[in-house]
């Protein structure tokens, strides 16, 4: 109960091409300290979609204010979805480390499917 859980409520989300996709993620604890990252895919070949700590991700916006004290909502919205964005997205909690942060726990993943743009 006390150990941090990463909850991605939806198993799957379907979005029409050109629209925005909201991928929801919540933590159950503020501990351990460390950033959140979103990836598409799992394993060594996974693609970084968003890094709370650093980087420029022009299509990604956070749904809530991540710097807000006691925030547990790490949902993101990805704009202008295309078929190339289809895949399984993982919300991953990292533990602050030196020199590098260490992966602590991953969400179960939300599969994003892309529907054809309505004509």
């Amino acid at each position: 109960e006390d150990e941090l859980q990463v909850i991605q409520p939806e198993k799957s989300v379907s979005v029409a091409a050109g629209e925005s996709a909201t991928l929801r993620c919540a933590m159950t604890s503020l501990i351990p300290v460390g950033p959140i990252m979103w990836f598409r895919g799992a394993g060594a070949g996974r693609e970084l979609i968003y890094n709370q700590k650093e980087g420029h991700f022009p299509r990604v916006t956070t749904v809530s204010e991540l710097t807000k004290r006691n925030n547990l909502d790490f949902s993101i919205s990805i704009s202008n979805i295309t078929p190339a964005d289809a895949g399984t997205y993982y919300c991953v909690k990292f533990r602050k480390g030196s020199p590098d942060d260490v992966e602590f726990k991953s969400g179960a993943g939300t599969e994003l499917s892309v529907r054809a743009k309505p004509s």
Epitope: E1, I7, E10, K11, R24, A26, L72, G109
Partner: antibody
Framework: QVQLVQSGAEVKKPGSSVKVSCKAS????????ISWVRQAPGQGLEWMGG????????NYAQKFQGRVTITADESTSTAYMELSSLRSEDTAVYYC???????????????WGQGTLVTVSS | DIVMTQSPLSLPVTPGEPASISCRSS???????????LDWYLQKPGQSPQLLIY???NRASGVPDRFSGSGSGTDFTLKISRVEAEDVGVYYC?????????FGGGTKVEIK
């Protein structure tokens, strides 16, 4: 230790509304889904809907869509279920149930309230 | 919605003997992640339901090891290796792969 304490029994007239509360203590309230499950006398279990307080939006079973409203107040760690246009068939025990530590919403219900009997009678 | 069908409806048991309850779903509960989204609950007389088994075969905290869950896809079984008097009540399976979650009709276990 997670505990869910529900409001007391209610007797309602047909056509009226009822609002049942479920106060959680122990553990994190905001991030876990809270569901409402009802049980008519001598019958089985029926999921009505649920909410993850941190996100605010609720999911409803189609059968109850438009008649049930599920809300949550993070400041008091309390979830609510309001059922409107009551009829005699809504006489049941209404349970709130909280998710366990699974990665998805409504994956399994690890903690249950004691139940609230709602009787609809003219 | 996914339809869950349990059998038998009623199960008279002898203490110390094994018991088995079947649950079938109208569509597969096996997710691409390898988990079966099938849970088992017990509702003892006059009490709220309690979680016994989640994700097909995982015993919930505090549940005795005489309870076990098995199966995959659309066919699942709850087994009690040696029934005790305190195991009486109604057992429900529930699918959790889709929203809304849906329950089986229940199996009433009673002592012979």
């Amino acid at each position: 230790q997670v505990q869910l304490v529900q409001s007391g029994a209610e007797v309602k007239k047909p056509g009226s509304s009822v609002k049942v509360s479920c106060k959680a203590s122990g553990g994190t309230f905001s991030s876990y889904a809270i569901s409402w499950v009802r049980q008519a006398p001598g019958q089985g279990l029926e999921w009505m809907g649920g909410i993850i307080p941190i996100f605010g939006t609720a999911n409803y079973a189609q059968k109850f869509q438009g008649r049930v409203t599920i809300t949550a107040d993070e400041s008091t760690s309390t979830a609510y279920m309001e059922l409107s246009s009551l009829r005699s068939e809504d006489t049941a025990v209404y349970y709130c149930a909280r998710d366990g530590g699974g990665g998805y919403a409504y994956e399994y219900f690890q903690h249950w309230g004691q139940g609230t009997l709602v009787t609809v009678s003219s | 919605d996914i339809v869950m069908t349990q059998s038998p409806l009623s199960l008279p048991v002898t203490p110390g003997e094994p018991a088995s309850i079947s649950c079938r779903s109208s569509q597969s509960l096996l997710h691409s992640n390898g988990y079966n989204y099938l849970d088992w609950y017990l509702q003892k007389p006059g009490q709220s339901p309690q979680l016994l088994i989640y994700l097909g075969s995982n015993r919930a905290s505090g549940v005795p090891d005489r309870f076990s869950g098995s199966g995959s896809g659309t066919d699942f079984t709850l087994k009690i290796s040696r029934v005790e008097a305190e195991d009486v009540g109604v057992y429900y399976c529930m699918q959790a792969i889709g929203v809304p979650p849906t329950f089986g009709g229940g199996t009433k276990v009673e002592i012979k």
